[in-house]
Interface confidence: medium
């Protein structure tokens, strides 16, 4: 992927809108939308003010760990859906899109240098462990996906892209 493709706001917005569509389609859906187990996902809460003052390398650690856990969670959701007796087609479509979207975002972040940033900060070893929550429905899973993209990921890419411009 081109190194700074994710710095084009339209790219992230595309994934954000996909995530929100998925969230919207599962609103009020009970019958087909239970995960039937608790899946661990990243806690998307962001202390905006603390985040803003964080070193970009520390931000990269949080984003990289969160993205990895979220990708695992969505893949687990996809597996559960495949194994269910009658997967709901619109849900299947959005889960598949989320899997594909997270793979693409991982590639785009790697191209931006997030992985290197996440390894190199001097205080990376002492970083607080990633906070997690659980999701028991696809609605919650998609809500976390949507929140993660427009929370930590958007804040991180905004800062990393600005830093790269200097």
């Amino acid at each position: 992927a081109p190194p700074r493709l994710i710095c084009d706001s339209r790219v992230l917005e595309r994934y954000l809108l996909e995530a929100k569509e998925a969230e919207n389609i599962t609103t009020g859906c009970a019958e087909h939308c239970s995960l039937n187990e608790n899946i661990t996902v990243p806690d998307t809460k962001v202390n905006f003010y603390a985040w803003k003052r964080m070193e970009v390398g520390q931000q990269a650690v949080e984003v990289w760990q969160g993205l990895a856990l979220l990708s695992e969670a969505v893949l687990r959701g996809q597996a559960l859906l495949v194994n269910s007796s009658q997967p709901w087609e619109p849900l299947q479509l959005h889960v598949d899109k989320a899997v594909s979207g997270l793979r693409s975002l991982t590639t785009l972040l790697r191209a931006l240098g997030a992985q290197k940033e996440a390894i190199s900060p001097p205080d990376a070893a002492s970083a607080a462990p990633l906070r997690t929550i659980t999701a028991d429905t696809f609605r919650k899973l998609f809500r976390v996906y949507s929140n993660f993209l427009r929370g930590k990921l958007k804040l991180y890419t905004g800062e990393a892209c600005r830093t790269g411009d200097r």
Epitope: L16, K20, K45, F48, Y49, R53, N147, R150
Partner: antibody
């Protein structure tokens, strides 16, 4: 229950400095989990966020682009309050001025939601 | 700078559903808040994070946000809901942006 009590003059002459204070009860101005804002409202400009201060091991502030060159927001820890100073005012700055508290730490939106407001102070800029 | 656009007024009969819209470029990718303001009073937060209600706000108030439009929905409207409603979003690093406000009239 957080309460915000505003004080300051209701009339300021053009080119002078507008000064308002917001006294906090039920929370601390130097809390690590809150942020303290000034917002104004006028018929011509509607609601307009002016700036924020917050304490995270040290003091930080952010100001709206529209007033950045003229605004200062300061904490007063001894009195548990914070103040607004707006320099070189013009009649355009005539508005109801509110102080408000926002709480960082929710999903990335709640931190900007202004959950507690002062009652507002009408400030008229006129000679 | 970012602009949020609201209709100046919305009218609704008591017991019916009122919908107030707020539009902005790709607004669905930002979080939206809604404030209720009655004459002579400070605004009151009724919705944050697009659709979450602070404690004390009735369930009749709900919100959604997708594409370019956020919507505040008030079901079973009561006379006491008559007020000005403002949407707001933190659409950039430092500036919180408010919409121009919508006057809700209960017929």
């Amino acid at each position: 229950q957080v309460q915000l009590q505003q004080s300051g003059p209701g009339l300021v002459k053009p080119s002078q400095t507008l000064s308002l204070t917001c006294a906090i009860s039920g929370d601390s101005v130097s809390s690590n989990t809150a942020a303290w804002n000034w917002i104004r409202q006028s018929p011509s400009r509607g609601l307009e966020w002016l700036g924020v201060i917050y304490y995270r091991s040290k003091w930080y502030n952010d100001y709206a682009v529209s007033v950045k060159s003229r605004i200062t927001i300061n904490p007063d820890t001894s009195k548990n309050q914070f103040s607004l100073q707006l320099n070189s005012v013009t009649p355009e700055d005539t508005a109801v001025y509110y102080c408000a508290r926002s709480v960082p730490g929710g999903d990335p939106g709640l931190e900007h939601a202004f959950a507690y407001w002062g009652r507002g102070t009408l400030v008229t800029v006129s000679s | 700078s970012y602009v949020l656009t609201q209709p100046p007024s919305v009218s609704v009969a008591p017991g019916k559903t009122a919908r107030i819209t707020c539009s902005g470029d790709n607004l669905g990718t930002y979080y939206v808040e809604w404030y209720q303001q009655k004459p002579g009073q400070a605004p009151v937060l009724v919705i944050y994070d697009d659709s979450d209600r602070p404690s004390g706000i009735p369930e009749r108030f709900s919100g959604s946000n997708s594409g370019n439009t956020a919507t505040l929905t008030i079901s079973r409207v009561e006379a006491g809901d008559e007020a000005d409603y403002y949407c707001a979003s933190f659409a950039s690093w430092s500036d919180s942006v408010f919409g121009g406000g919508t006057k809700l009239t209960v017929l």
